[in-house]
């Protein structure tokens, strides 16, 4: 089955500048600004765009060593980000993939919105554990705001 | 256990260059931001600049930018703070300190390094 | 460059009283500041991180809040060796003034 869990958040970060540093250079600034959470960014194949797959390793004593992540879409103009993670992680028996959808809206006091979209793809009728949702979502708030306080006390960077 | 362990007091000549140092041990120093933080005699804490050892991506407070040169060898886990031309204004206890708590907070630090600058 | 105006400068107490220490950013800095400790000769101690997480180590008694451009310090009930200077600081950026903890 597909199960749908949808969540916003908000930024006192730009749009254009959050996409650029979140999205575009995420490989890179994750691990240094959420070493707690994330151990390294790996390119297996590709430039980035569609097709790209990367590893993703956590730290020690973290519950999963490593998931892959495949590229979907990267669209610049519409600040849009859609991956599917595909392999490691809680990919395995039950659940075949997760497709994630980020959408990086301005509002207009400069700020932004993300919009996020997660679809579990589970094998047959298993159902999505709930605590895996709540890693997941855990997991994105704590490298969107490592990347926010990076990003408020470095006003040349990213833009 | 984490240690920073800096180089030792240097009494210099307006004019000499000086580079000083923070060994880091006890954890992966490449994975970590080293910051530097001055402190002129009587006064506060200055934030000057940051150092990801992995990378070798510097950040500088822009007063700082062009007056010191931060850098690092990860291969002797040791950061550096560097002038080419030393200021009797640069009279000051220098400390480094390692960015591990969440949002950058310096959780540990060394135990400073004396720079007394002097004619 | 966002400013971090620390208040007061110094101030006088006694042991057992309750203090506070408060810090305001020139612009919103959402919950990224850390609080430090600093005794003379000795190099800064980590106290509180992103405004309110109390440090590993850290005593009890030492509380942060506050959100946005406004954040506060509590010692709940001050004790002998918590005269020090008291430093905020934005994450990654400039630290307040300092404010000094002195015997009444």
């Known amino acids: 089955g597909v199960f749908n869990y949808e969540t916003e958040t908000t930024s006192v970060i730009p749009a254009a500048r959050l996409f650029k540093a979140f999205i575009l250079d995420g490989d890179n600034l994750f691990p240094k600004v959420a070493p707690q959470a994330i151990s390294s960014v790996e390119n297996i194949e590709g430039n980035g765009g569609p097709g790209t797959i990367k590893k993703i390793s956590f730290p020690e004593g973290f519950p999963f060593k490593y998931v892959k992540d495949r590229v979907d879409e990267v669209d610049h103009t519409n600040f849009k980000y859609n991956y599917s993670v595909i392999e490691g992680g809680p990919i395995g028996d039950t659940l075949e993939k997760i497709s994630n959808e980020i959408k990086i809206v301005a509002t207009p006091d400069g700020g932004s919105i993300l919009k996020i979209s997660n679809k579990y793809h589970t094998k047959g009728d298993h159902e999505v554990k709930a605590e895996q949702v709540k890693a997941s979502k855990e997991m994105g708030e704590t490298l969107l705001r490592a990347v926010e306080s990076y990003l408020l006390a470095h006003s040349d960077a990213y833009n | 256990e984490v240690q920073l362990v800096q180089s030792g007091a240097e009494v210099k000549k307006p004019g000499e260059s000086l580079n000083i140092s923070c060994n880091g041990s006890?954890?992966?120093?490449?994975?970590?931001?080293i910051a530097w933080v001055r402190q002129m005699p009587g006064k506060g804490l200055e934030w000057m600049g940051i150092?990801?050892?992995?990378?070798?991506?510097?950040k500088y407070r822009p007063s700082f930018q062009g007056q010191v040169t931060i850098s690092a060898d990860k291969s002797i886990t040791t950061a550096y703070l560097q002038w080419s031309r030393l200021k009797v204004s640069d009279t000051a206890i220098y400390y480094c300190a390692r960015l591990g708590a969440t949002y950058g907070g310096a959780d540990y630090w060394g135990q400073g390094t004396l720079v007394t600058v002097s004619s | 460059d966002i400013q971090m105006t620390q208040s007061p400068s110094s101030l006088s107490a006694s042991v057992g009283d309750r203090v506070t220490i408060t810090c305001q950013a020139s612009?919103?800095?959402?919950?990224?500041l850390n609080w430090y400790q600093q005794k003379p000769g000795k190099a800064p101690k980590l106290l509180i991180y992103?405004?309110?997480s109390l440090q590993s180590g850290v005593p009890s008694r030492f509380s942060g809040s506050g959100s946005g451009t406004d954040f506060t310090l509590t010692i709940s009930s001050l004790q002998p060796e918590d005269f020090a200077t008291y430093y905020c600081q934005q994450s990654y950026a400039a630290f307040g003034e300092g404010t000094k903890v002195e015997i009444t």
């Open positions: 150092i990801y050892p992995g990378d070798s991506d510097t």
């Open positions: 006890g954890y992966n120093f490449t994975k970590y931001w």
């Open positions: 992103a405004a309110s």
């Open positions: 612009q919103s800095i959402v919950n990224y």
